[in-house]
């Protein structure tokens, strides 16, 4: 059985999937539908770097760029840096500056939704 | 404004190779993925791949996966697409197409490849 | 792989009448979370290359006249020309983009009556 053919017997069980799951998917050569994607739990995708949502969608990643201000896809591009937003070769913005560093700090997050960064 | 320029008209015998250009120009050549179509005479249109400028990633419809190979020179803003083991059935005008978020939003005029004993 | 059936094959229609265009995918192509269908419908005059018209299945390029117009979502769409001009003859294809390989229909001829 191919990734895609995998994909497709087991799409109806992702939407509660945890990240550790989807880091494992990731590698199964699976090329995940946008769609699908998107009712991923938030806290689930925010986790993933850019590499792992690459090999997680595959020919799919390239939707991004026309969903990017939709949730989760919005929030997932906040907390990425912007140098492996551009490996991606989609034109998306509002990565986090390359020279900053990123704290995570739970409590600040909880409460503005977005990573707390440092200045270069 | 954009422009997609392809390299110009073949003929192949079977079993042979061709590799089409497609010069794109007018836009940032890294921020938009480029797909490659085609069209048999009369007929309609077959996705065939789409590339990654800036990683060179590429993913081709299975349909063409052991014979197609895509890829891009960033330095003079150019994707190709080669196809191997050429037959009669691959005579077709192919086209890149620029990316505008997953639909085609600029085509190249398009290369008439003719595959002929 | 999501089979695209456009219908009609051709059509004739009179300078100034409608012309109406349906594709019909095997599987929805609708986003429920962003609610974008990801269709898109192509224009194709003769001897030429492609051009958009329409994406997310009713959103018209910029430059396309407001004549043309898409509508529909999951599985059913259409292309509506509400008013032919001469300049419309083409073939005119849907494509959906929802997952690879991305796929079209088999072109509808939009001809003068």
């Known amino acids: 059985m191919n990734g895609s053919e995998y994909f497709v017997k087991i799409q109806s069980f992702l939407g509660g999937a945890p990240t550790e799951d989807l880091k494992a998917l990731s590698q199964q050569n699976v090329s995940m539908d946008l769609a699908t994607f998107m009712k991923l739990r938030t806290d689930a995708v925010l986790p993933l770097t850019v590499a792992e949502v690459q090999k997680l969608l595959g020919p799919h990643v390239e939707g991004l760029k026309a969903e990017e201000r939709h949730r989760p896809v919005r929030d997932w591009i906040l907390r990425q840096r912007q140098d492996d937003l551009d490996t991606l070769g989609l034109g998306l913005q509002g990565g986090i500056p390359n020279g900053y560093l990123v704290l995570d700090l739970s409590m600040q997050e909880a409460l503005s939704g977005t990573p707390c960064l440092l200045g270069p | 404004e954009v422009q997609l320029v392809q390299s110009g008209a073949e003929v192949k015998k079977p079993g042979a190779s061709v590799k089409v250009s497609c010069k794109a120009s007018?836009?940032?050549?890294?921020?938009?993925?480029m797909h490659w179509v085609r069209q048999a005479p009369g007929q309609g249109l077959e996705w065939m791949g789409n590339?990654?400028?800036?990683?060179?990633?590429?993913y081709y419809n299975e349909r063409f996966m052991s014979r197609v190979t895509m890829t891009v020179d960033k330095s003079t803003s150019t994707a190709y697409m080669e196809l191997s083991s050429l037959r009669s059935e691959d005579t077709a005008v192919y086209y890149c197409?620029?990316?505008?978020?997953?639909?085609?939003?600029?085509w190249g005029q398009g290369t008439l490849v003719t595959v002929s004993s | 792989d999501i089979v695209m059936t456009q219908s009609p094959d051709s059509l004739a229609v009179s300078l100034g009448e409608r012309a109406t265009i349906n594709c019909k995918s095997s599987q929805t192509l609708l986003n429920s979370v962003s609610q974008n269908n990801y269709l898109a419908w192509y224009q194709q005059k003769p001897g030429q290359s492609p051009t958009l018209l329409i994406y997310?299945?009713?959103t018209r390029e910029s430059g396309v006249p407001d004549r043309f117009s898409g509508s529909g979502s999951g599985t059913d769409f259409t292309l509506t020309i509400s008013s032919l001009q001469a300049e419309d003859v083409a073939v005119y294809y849907c494509?959906?983009?929802?997952?690879?390989?991305?796929?079209f229909g088999g072109g509808t001829k939009v001809e003068i009556k």
């Open positions: 494509q959906q983009h929802y997952r690879t390989p991305y796929t």
């Open positions: 590339i990654n400028p800036s990683s060179g990633d590429s």
């Open positions: 007018g836009y940032t050549f890294t921020n938009y993925w």
């Open positions: 197409a620029r990316s505008g978020g997953l639909w085609l939003a600029f």
């Open positions: 997310f299945a009713s």
